[in-house]
Interface confidence: medium
């Protein structure tokens, strides 16, 4: 949950190209104004995933998900909350 | 704001070579399964995508990191 | 009941063009990627293009590369392979197979065949 | 590119005998292996997907094993109707075919 907070477009994006759909790429991809030549990209990886199979995306997704709540990240999730919380409080 | 630990991750999925990649998973997950697959899914990437694929594809995640949506 | 049925084949001399057809029926057309895979007399299979499920993505073996036009219309329900510049050695039974959803199972099922022969 | 080497090229099998084909990749293709099951003067029809997953309505005798760079398609038990061509296919960057194993009836 909060990885996907951190940065929601992007891990939309991740799981539509890992998920194999296309359809549910070109959403996501819209939502950021892709161009043809961007969505053509996008398109190539998502190939790679759909050609490998559902055991290839389960585990790449496992990789996405480890790094994204990693200390490397939480840590400076907690470190973003502390910030905000403190421009919060001096805001007040 | 995207974790530097998944841009890094990206970036190299993208730019760098099949070893740096796999290198920079195993500091996360070190199962061999999943280095195994994540050395396919590169190769496959680098395979398929020419340069100007990987400049559009970055310059998608500029889009996507710079969003208001992140 | 999954129907594909391959059609345009037949003799055009070195340097011809030729376009094959594909007419899918008894599934969804738009949902699956497509293949074409063509067989010489006697010979394995070769596989020479697909193509995404909207048309997006397209791949071709670097034997037709530049030569071969994958494209598809939903709509219709139709495959199609533009084949320019014919070669004699790409003489074969050019088949149309599909994929299962997303991929999850390249050619399950497969059409007849047509026969292209390049020859003068 | 990668490349399918399958072996035997040929087999000549005596019915209820065990066939084993092997596929080796030229470099590692996790599971993104197939097996096609090729009789004359008809299409290739999937036997199994995915290295080790059978196709709905392939006979049980038809298994698959294998991940990276070996793979074995094994009939358990040959009947006639098993001489064939068979074919493996890899699936993990674009695509490409092995040679073909033919396998004869005694």
């Known amino acids: 949950v909060k990885m996907a907070e951190t940065c929601p477009i992007f891990y939309d994006v991740f799981f539509a190209v890992a998920n194999g759909n296309e359809l549910l790429l070109d959403l996501s991809l819209t939502k950021v104004n892709a161009t043809e030549p961007e969505r053509t990209a996008m398109k190539k990886i998502q190939d790679c995933y759909v050609e490998n199979g559902l055991i290839s995306r389960v585990l790449d997704g496992l990789v996405m998900t480890t790094i994204s709540s990693s200390k490397d990240c939480m840590g400076e999730a907690v470190q973003n909350t502390v910030e905000d919380l403190k421009l919060n409080t001096l805001g007040r | 704001e995207i974790c530097p630990a998944v841009k890094r991750d990206v970036d190299l999925f993208l730019t760098g070579t099949p070893d740096e990649y796999v290198e920079q998973v195993a500091q996360y997950k070190a199962l061999p399964v999943v280095l195994e697959n994540a050395r396919i899914l590169k190769n496959c990437v680098d395979a398929k995508m020419t340069e100007e694929d990987k400049e559009n594809a970055l310059s998608l995640l500029d889009k996507i990191y710079t969003s208001p949506l992140c | 009941e999954v129907q594909l049925v391959e059609s345009g084949g037949g003799l055009v001399k070195p340097g011809g063009s030729l376009r094959l057809s594909c007419a899918a029926s008894?599934?969804?057309?738009?949902?699956?990627?497509m293949n074409w895979i063509r067989q010489a007399p006697g010979k394995g299979l070769e596989w020479v293009s697909y193509?995404?499920?909207?048309?997006?993505?397209?791949y071709y073996a670097d034997s037709v590369k530049g030569r071969f036009t994958i494209s598809r219309d939903n709509a219709k329900n139709s495959l199609y392979l533009l084949m320019n510049s014919l070669r004699a050695e790409d003489t074969a039974v050019y088949y149309c197979?599909?994929?299962?959803?997303?991929?999850?199972?390249?050619?399950?099922?497969w059409g007849q065949g047509t026969l292209v022969t390049v020859s003068s | 590119e990668i490349v399918l080497t399958q072996s035997p090229d040929f087999q000549s099998v005596t019915p209820k005998e065990k066939v084993t084909i092997t596929c080796r990749a030229s470099?590692?293709?996790?599971?993104?292996l197939h097996w096609y099951q090729q009789k004359p003067d008809q299409s290739p029809k999937l036997l199994i997907k995915?290295?080790?997953q059978s196709f709905s309505g392939v006979p049980s005798r038809f298994s698959g094993s294998g991940s990276g760079t070996d793979f074995t398609l094994t009939i358990n038990s040959l009947e006639a109707e098993d001489a064939a061509t068979y074919y493996c296919?890899?699936?993990?960057?674009?695509?490409?075919f092995g040679q073909g194993t033919k396998v004869e009836i005694k």
């Open positions: 197979a599909r994929d299962g959803k997303y991929n999850s199972s390249p050619g399950d099922y």
């Open positions: 008894g599934f969804t057309f738009s949902d699956y990627y």
């Open positions: 193509i995404s499920s909207s048309g997006s993505s397209i």
């Open positions: 470099q590692s293709i996790g599971g993104s």
């Open positions: 995915y290295a080790s």
């Open positions: 296919l890899q699936s993990s960057s674009l695509r490409t």
